[in-house]
């Protein structure tokens, strides 16, 4: 018998050599191993020439080892995974020219205090490379530009003060990040491109708050569902979010997201996240909708209310610069949830930031009546066009939306998502979209209807109209907005039933009419008829806290204007507060949010 | 066209020793992993062993250290030597050619009995 | 070890019905790498050798009639007989070719109605 147990897993034969308390290569290996474990044993050095002739071999396990030194002077054409963690390595060789197929390199818990600019050359298959618990104290310039299929990099635990600025550059398939538990104080500008990584953990460094952090501080706010805060042995795919987790060490540990960065400069160059004003505005063709995964479910509920609108016009506008603009491919998640909840990040325990977040949507009166009908609601033919083709231009510094007609689609079996982030473009012709935003149209103050169309659609029998995107205001006349991504539904037991399927429609200037089409459950037999007398305005209305303390309903209203309508990529959104809110702090454009 | 023809069965006594061949023709013998497979009377089936085509022999721990399988690539045969037998060794003993480096049973012979009683 | 259990143990059914058979492996037969699932069908007649119908969950191996059809990934997976024949009357194995040791289920016997 071999002193190796030998088995076989997926066609591949698997040789087990751990802990045998071998100081070399086994002699009796068999020449078709396939897999072959040599953890645990006192190897001291290994050179790759000892394994050439194993033509089969996929993945080789060296953990554990007391290995000092490694050599790559044998070529070995099918490796795919290498696994040299937990040894006393203080530099690596070269790897790609002896291990071109590489996939999956794991040189975690080793003595590494800086990597050779030219280590990861060749390696053009590389998925996954893990870095985490050495000594690094910086990375060289290009270090991963050979390594264009990279999908999850490890770099925590180490010493690293600073990042290369172009480090992630060409990275597109990247989707797991780690940087916790470092030594670093900011984050270049345009580190992060425009690359969309959907699990990056940045928690436990040493951040420090000042105008340098504003490029950072606006990526955290507009992927503050993608930032995580690691634990030991917890799957990420099984945490919340948890943007608070990133915190200024110059602070007092206050949250990086939230610096209101007052006295720094506000040029675009600044603050933009990055130079978007150059890019021209693209006809759209395809809806594609990118999700979190996230599956504990932290829930809050929302309040559906009916008000009279507020009869003053006088507002202050807060002008926001444009949001990120993806434009790179990213893996959809399916988010399921609750219908009436809503997932919100999870945040650490101190420190409660308040936001608030209204979407008012105004129904000029008609003596127009809903009627449950079982069969879908048949578009006007003026709103055809949703079903074929959306193009999104706009003037640059209009301040009258232009009129668009724009769909977003939600996987058929989900149950109210949540989009991180979305390209909105129109499904096909022959698919029935299942909508959970719509283009947010307000009127101006002149009270000038502007001819728009926005189709809402819930999946399954709901209560509430569910636009699922909004901006926020954020703090002090901050210059970034902070996004957020919800569903805005109703609790239980909301005395007011809203449509499942409506069509709004506001009409030219020259009607004074709504029209609502609906689509209900034959189970819901209510007619909501809307009076002609008196206008009514529905506001969807959030408070939440870091904290998720829920917050009572508050009457004032909060407008958002787009100045060009590519929704959910706001290019700029005016945040309108109107003036008989003044006695509530969190309606008040002065003072939008309670900070700590 | 394939074929596997085992031989070496018969009756033995609880820890005697036997062993059972499989002839092959109709394929590149040396090319293939082989295997045997067994069926206790009104049971099921249940892998016994497998060698690959470098000569690399793998058990299932109810057989391991008593079984041993061997290949003559010269004769195109296929061997189980089978030490230590047990009452709960009796079955049909069938020969399977696996498929490249797959280990699923593409061919397999007609058995042989091996019957392990006092 | 990955366990591996057939259901029903044995079915009555009549010439041009169609048959369902089920296996459940206790862990995923999934492989990421080539995102293939190892599990392999076989049929045997009494007194007869094993006869392999389907590998990879449904790839039919050659000769193998096109009323055979097998589905399935990750744990459980299903054998389909469209329209039963006088010759499918038989035990039907299922079996996992992605870990060693291989086991298989303890068995389907399809008897005539």
């Known amino acids: 018998q071999h002193t190796c147990s030998i088995s076989k897993v997926t066609s591949l034969l698997e040789v087990n050599c751990e802990n045998k308390k071998l100081t070399a290569l086994p002699a009796d290996l068999p020449a078709d191993t396939g897999i072959l474990h040599l953890g645990e044993n006192q190897l001291g050095t290994f050179s790759t020439a000892s394994l050439v002739h194993f033509t089969h071999l996929t993945y080789l396990y060296l953990d554990r080892c007391e290995l000092t030194s490694l050599q790559t002077n044998g070529k070995l054409i099918k490796l795919e995974n290498l696994d040299l963690s937990h040894n006393n390595l203080k530099s690596l060789p070269s790897l790609g020219w002896a291990l071109p197929a590489l996939t999956t390199l794991d040189v975690s818990f080793n003595k590494l205090g800086s990597l050779s600019p030219g280590v990861l050359d060749g390696l053009s298959q590389l998925q996954e490379l893990y870095l985490q618990n050495n000594d690094l104290k910086s990375l060289p310039p290009g270090l991963l530009l050979p390594t264009t299929k990279l999908k999850k990099l490890n770099l925590a635990n180490n010493k690293l003060r600073e990042l290369p600025s172009g480090l992630l550059d060409g990275l597109e398939d990247l989707d797991t990040l780690y940087l916790q538990r470092n030594w670093l104080r900011t984050i270049p500008k345009g580190f992060f491109g425009t690359l969309l990584l959907p699990f990056v953990f940045l928690h436990a460094n040493s951040w420090y708050c000042d105008c340098e952090i504003l490029y950072f501080r606006h990526w955290l706010q507009e992927n503050a569902n993608n930032v995580y805060l690691w634990k030991q042995g917890v799957d990420v795919k099984d945490t919340t979010p948890n943007v608070a987790s990133v915190r200024c060490a110059n602070l007092d540990n206050a949250p990086v997201y939230s610096y209101p960065g007052k006295g720094c400069p506000t040029s675009s160059g600044d603050t933009d996240y990055d130079d978007y004003d150059d890019i021209p505005d693209v006809p759209a063709t395809r809806t594609e909708v990118k999700f979190s995964t996230n599956t504990k479910v932290h829930t809050t509920h929302w309040s559906l209310l009916a008000a009279a609108p507020s009869t003053s016009q006088d507002s202050q506008m807060i002008s926001l610069p444009p949001t990120h603009k993806p434009t790179k491919k990213q893996s959809t998640f399916i988010h399921t949830q609750s219908p009436g909840f809503t997932t919100l990040p999870e945040t650490m325990e101190s420190n409660p930031t308040f936001y608030s977040l209204k979407l008012n949507t105004v129904l000029i009166p008609s003596p127009t009546t809903l009627e449950p009908t079982s069969t879908q609601a048949t578009p006007e033919p003026n709103i055809q066009p949703m079903l074929t083709t959306s193009t999104l231009t706009t003037p640059e510094h209009s301040t009258t939306p232009v009129p668009t007609t724009t769909i977003l689609t939600t996987p058929e079996h989900s149950t109210i998502p949540v989009p991180t982030t979305a390209i909105l473009t129109t499904p096909k012709p022959s698919t029935i979209p299942v909508p959970t935003t719509a283009t947010l149209t307000t009127l101006e103050p002149s009270t000038t209807p502007v001819p728009t169309t926005a189709t809402l659609t819930t999946p399954e029998p709901s209560t509430t109209l569910v636009p699922t995107t909004a901006t926020l205001t954020t703090p002090e006349h901050s210059t970034t907005p902070v996004p957020t991504t919800a569903t805005l539904t109703t609790p239980e037991h909301s005395t007011t039933p809203v449509p499942t399927t409506a069509t709004l429609t506001t009409p030219e200037p020259s009607t004074t009419l709504t029209n609502l089409v609906s689509t209900i459950s034959p189970v819901l037999t209510t007619t909501l008829t809307t009076p002609e007398s008196t206008p009514i305005e529905t506001i969807l209305e959030q408070f939440f806290t870091t904290e998720l303390t829920l917050l009572p309903t508050l009457e004032s209203t909060t407008t958002i204007i787009p100045e060009q309508n590519s929704f959910l990529n706001l290019p700029e959104v005016a945040l309108v507060s109107s003036d008989t809110s003044e006695s509530s702090p969190f309606l008040n454009s002065d003072f939008c949010c309670f900070l700590p | 066209e394939v074929q596997l023809v085992e031989s070496g069965g018969g009756l033995v006594q609880p820890g005697g020793s036997l062993r059972l061949s499989c002839a092959a023709s109709g394929f590149t013998f040396s090319s293939f992993a082989m295997s045997w497979v067994r069926q206790a009377p009104g049971k099921g089936l249940e892998w016994v062993s497998s060698?690959?085509?470098?000569?690399?022999?793998y058990y299932p721990d109810s057989v391991l250290g008593r079984f041993t399988i061997s290949r003559d690539n010269s004769k195109n045969t296929l061997y189980l030597q089978m030490n230590s037998l047990r009452a709960e060794d009796t079955a049909v003993y069938y020969c399977a050619k696996s498929r490249g480096y797959e280990d699923y049973f593409d061919y397999w012979g007609q058995g042989t009995l091996v019957t392990v009683s006092s | 070890d990955i366990q591996m259990t057939q259901s029903p143990s044995s079915l009555s059914a009549s010439v041009g019905d169609r048959v369902t058979i089920t296996c459940k492996s206790s862990q995923s037969l999934l492989n990421s790498r080539n995102q293939k699932n190892y599990l392999a069908w076989y049929q045997q007649k009494p007194g007869k050798a094993p006869k392999l119908l389907i590998y990879?969950?449904?790839t039919r191996e050659s000769g193998v009639p096109s009323r055979f059809s097998g589905s399935g990934s990750g744990t459980d997976f299903t054998l389909t007989i469209s329209s039963l024949q006088p010759e499918d009357f038989a035990t039907y194995y299922c079996?996992?070719?992605?870990?060693?040791?291989?086991?298989f289920g303890q068995g389907t016997k399809v008897e005539i109605k």
């Open positions: 060698i690959t085509s470098a000569g690399t022999p």
């Open positions: 079996q996992q070719h992605y870990s060693s040791p291989w086991t």
């Open positions: 990879f969950t449904s």
